[in-house]
């Protein structure tokens, strides 16, 4: 037996002016049939029948997955981060082979002192999370390490992280210039070789809500756009109300098609509505026909 899906019919007038009956199943889209056991359903656009109903893929919904949603959930990360690969040369500690072993007492003590020193250096940077030593080598001690930065996601996160990386560069340059050995002795927590300070690489979290929105919208990518509300991105079509890009269909219903958003104008007992935004009303004539 076939699973039947009720199809409701609405009397609407397209923006071109002609009255049309629109079934909720869009006959212009090829139908794929999904069969589970002896049930089958006309689940379209990649949707599948779960035994009870069509399970639709984004951006579709409806009994047959024939309609396009007005908004798509996009979830930016709570926080975004940057990782700076730096090298500094510590002159107040002499290199020994034990420093290469990350489980040695020597490495653990060096790591503790170095971390304390860097926490002091970067204490004024709100995005600063910590440092991670990746390698120690001879000369006195060349310290290859990562500086980790993190901030809450906002539309301007890249600027915030870029600014933080610049401050890191300024601060490490300053400390490695000021904290130097005098008479083969260090009066600071750590002393450095000024010329040994290098920024090797900077990696910033890449998150683009526009890209995520376009990917999820699939063939409707050109018609979905990102708008922000309270610093949060929303992936919307013009049919979603309450946004700057929202389409006002006045006396009609906004519907997405593969050509974009269009208004399907209503016909009431007294008026026909037409126009691109269904804002042109024509009063029906009240002639009575006598038989």
């Amino acid at each position: 037996p076939l699973a039947t899906i009720p199809v409701s019919t609405t009397s609407l007038t397209s923006s071109e002016g002609s009255t049309i009956s629109t079934p909720s199943v869009d006959i212009s889209t090829p139908v794929t049939t999904s069969i589970v056991g002896d049930q089958c359903s006309r689940c379209k656009n990649g949707g599948f029948w779960d035994g009870l109903k069509c399970q639709c893929l984004t951006p579709y919904y409806g009994e047959s997955c024939e309609e396009v949603v007005n908004s798509i959930d996009i979830a930016p990360p709570e926080t975004v981060s940057a990782q700076m690969e730096l090298t500094v040369t510590v002159t107040s500690v002499k290199f020994t082979d034990e420093l290469k072993n990350h489980s040695s007492q020597e490495f653990r003590e060096f790591n503790k002192t170095f971390t304390e020193q860097m926490n002091i250096v970067y204490s004024g940077i709100p995005e600063y999370v910590g440092v991670n030593i990746t390698n120690l080598r001879l000369g006195s001690v060349v310290v290859e390490h990562d500086v980790l930065l993190r901030t809450k996601y906002t539309p301007e996160y890249k600027t915030a992280l870029d600014n933080a990386t610049e401050v890191v560069k300024q601060k490490i340059t300053k400390v490695t210039t000021e904290q130097i050995m005098t008479n083969d002795n260090c009066s600071a927590l750590m002393c450095f070789n000024t010329t040994g300070t290098q920024v090797q690489n900077i990696t910033v979290t890449q998150y683009d809500p526009v890209e995520e929105c376009r990917q999820k919208a699939e063939e409707y990518e050109d018609y979905f756009l990102v708008e922000y509300r309270d610093q949060k991105p929303y992936c919307i079509s013009p049919c979603e109300s309450g946004f700057n890009a929202s389409k006002n269909c006045n006396h009609g219903k906004c519907q997405m098609s593969q050509n974009g958003a269009r208004c399907l104008c209503v016909t009431t007992e007294t008026h026909w509505y037409s126009g691109e935004d269904c804002n042109q009303g024509t009063q029906k004539s009240h002639h009575h026909h006598h038989h």
Epitope: S92, E109, K112, D184
Partner: nanobody
């Protein structure tokens, strides 16, 4: 757990001498560094002398030529020979140790400490 115990402090007249000792619980620091620090009442702790496993020694300017740091690895001991003592040398003297070959007389660079021994220079 590493333990450091100082001894040898006491009351001495100006111009006199004292020898401080520091016993480490094992020879862990024979490949690192050991040092002496002091702290006078109401003042910050300051570095006095360092000795490292590579034979390097360093002294604070105020004690150069008067104090000598030495080590006996066989006995896991550190010493500070103090000559020509002055009233301004009066302080609590602390032994500190590090697994690292350090060149730093900043107390924050040192992670292992003894309880201290009092040195008073007075007539």
């Amino acid at each position: 757990d590493v333990q450091l115990v100082e001894s040898g402090g006491g009351l001495v007249q100006p111009g006199g001498s004292l020898r401080l000792s520091c016993a480490a619980s094992d020879n862990t620091f024979s490949r690192g560094s050991m040092s002496w620090f002091r702290q006078a009442p109401g003042k910050e702790r300051e570095g006095v002398a360092i000795i490292s496993s590579d034979g390097w020694t360093g002294y604070a300017d105020s004690v150069k030529g008067r104090f000598t740091i030495s080590q006996d690895n066989a006995k896991n001991s550190l010493y500070l020979q103090m000559n020509s003592l002055r009233a301004e040398d009066t302080a609590m003297y602390y032994c500190a140790a590090s697994f690292l070959v350090l060149r730093a007389l900043n107390p924050k660079a040192w992670h292992y400490w003894g309880q201290g021994t009092q040195v008073t220079v007075s007539s």
